[in-house]
């Protein structure tokens, strides 16, 4: 039997049953999430659930730029350091950089400081690039 790999929307890239879209536009976290949702298919800001997934994403983004942080779907909606993925995925894999997570920083970004392999918290109203994800 021939197993067909599902196709992603134009410009989105495929990895292990998911499609990813890297948006090089500036949006605050909530506007980025709304834009992801606007593409349908259950798209949200991306959850990153393993080192393998993180490495694939990081390699892809590094082909475009190495200096701008990128919003992902991890946030702290109750502002109590209770982080959760906006798409409902289990918060098991963690890749925080060593920076302090205090202050008014309740949204997570992939940090350019470690080639996008680690995360930092940031103020949710900051306008940044963002990464969307859906399962085709």
């Amino acid at each position: 039997d021939i197993i067909m790999r599902p196709s992603c929307a134009p410009g989105w890239f495929y990895h292990k049953s998911n499609c990813y879209g890297y948006f090089r536009k500036l949006r605050n976290w909530s506007d980025a999430e709304l834009e992801c949702q606007s593409y349908g298919n259950g798209a949200h800001l991306a959850s990153i659930l393993s080192l393998k997934e993180a490495s694939t994403i990081a390699e892809y983004i590094s082909g475009y730029q190495r200096s701008q942080p990128i919003w992902i779907g991890l946030h702290d909606p109750q502002k109590r350091q209770q982080w959760q993925w906006i798409d409902g995925a289990m918060y098991l894999y963690r890749s925080w950089s060593g920076k302090s997570m205090g202050g008014n920083k309740h949204c997570a970004e992939m940090s350019s400081n470690n080639n996008f392999l680690t995360w930092s918290s940031n103020e949710c109203n900051k306008r940044q690039h963002f990464l969307c994800k859906y399962r085709p």
């Epitope: 134009p10 989105w12 890297y22 090089r24 536009k25 593409y39 475009y64």
Partner: antibody, heavy 121, light 109 residues
Framework: EVQLLESGGGLVQPGGSLRLSCAAS????????MSWVRQAPGKGLEWVSA????????YYADSVKGRFTISRDNSKNTLYLQMNSLRAEDTAVYYC??????????????WGRGTTVTVSS | FMLTQPHSVSESPGKTVTLSCTRS????????VQWYQQRPGSSPILVIF?????PSGVPDRFSGSIDSTSNSASLTISGLQSEDEGDYYC?????????FGGGTKVTVL
């Protein structure tokens, strides 16, 4: 008043060199990325090269890579384009354009009047 | 990738024209699209930035939009006036380079 003024264009033989300058005024020059965009006679716009506000990052179109060098002197508020190994297809009006931010990939919100480069024997 | 624009468009004063800009590969949504107006003998002027934003001084007759289904951007000029005549270029970027469309010549009849 925000202004960009190009100079240095002229007639040059194929294989020759030319250095274009763009004098900026009316804004904090070092806070903005800058680009060169050209327009061949009767043709459309073609991006040539870009440089970040600090000058630390430079970018080139494939058509000029290895022949042209972009640079800036923030103390003089001036952008440069050193053009070597010129070809007939480099004949164009060269515009200096300001990017809307410190990184090169933004809108071009201010344009100069352009300087004409003619490559011919 | 390339940005493809129709070569020319003509319309009467007061009417509305919509110019298209289609991206050949990659998603039009991933990067901002800008639009520039170039009147004959003049330098280009930014009329739309970041897909749909108008710089101060540009009339609200100019509007921009993105359609991910057709993978294209559009510039709409309503209430067409004689001074709108000229060439219009879309522009975006990808992989450390800027890309312009070939331009659309707008003629006001």
């Amino acid at each position: 008043e925000v202004q960009l003024l190009e100079s240095g264009g002229g007639l040059v033989q194929p294989g020759g060199s030319l250095r274009l300058s763009c004098a900026a005024s009316g804004f904090t020059f070092s806070s903005y990325a800058m680009s060169w965009v050209r327009q061949a006679p009767g043709k459309g716009l073609e991006w040539v090269s870009a440089i970040s506000g600090s000058g630390g990052s430079t970018y080139y179109a494939d058509s000029v890579k290895g022949r042209f060098t972009i640079s800036r002197d923030n103390s003089k508020n001036t952008l440069y384009l050193q053009m070597n190994s010129l070809r007939a297809e480099d004949t164009a009006v060269y515009y200096c354009a300001r990017g809307a931010g410190a990184t090169p990939f933004n809108a071009f919100d201010i344009w100069g009047r352009g300087t004409t480069v003619t490559v011919s024997s | 990738f390339m940005l493809t624009q129709p070569h020319s468009v003509s319309e009467s004063p007061g009417k509305t024209v919509t110019l298209s800009c289609t991206r050949s590969s990659g998603s039009i949504s991933f990067d901002y699209v800008q639009w520039y107006q170039q009147r004959p003998g003049s330098s280009p002027i930014l009329v739309i930035f970041e897909d749909d934003q108008r710089p101060s001084g540009v009339p609200d007759r100019f509007s921009g939009s993105i359609d991910s289904t057709s993978n294209s951007a559009s510039l709409t000029i309503s209430g067409l006036q004689s001074e709108d005549e000229g060439d219009y270029y879309c522009q975006t970027y990808d992989d450390n380079r800027q890309v312009f469309g070939g331009g659309t010549k707008v003629t006001v009849l």
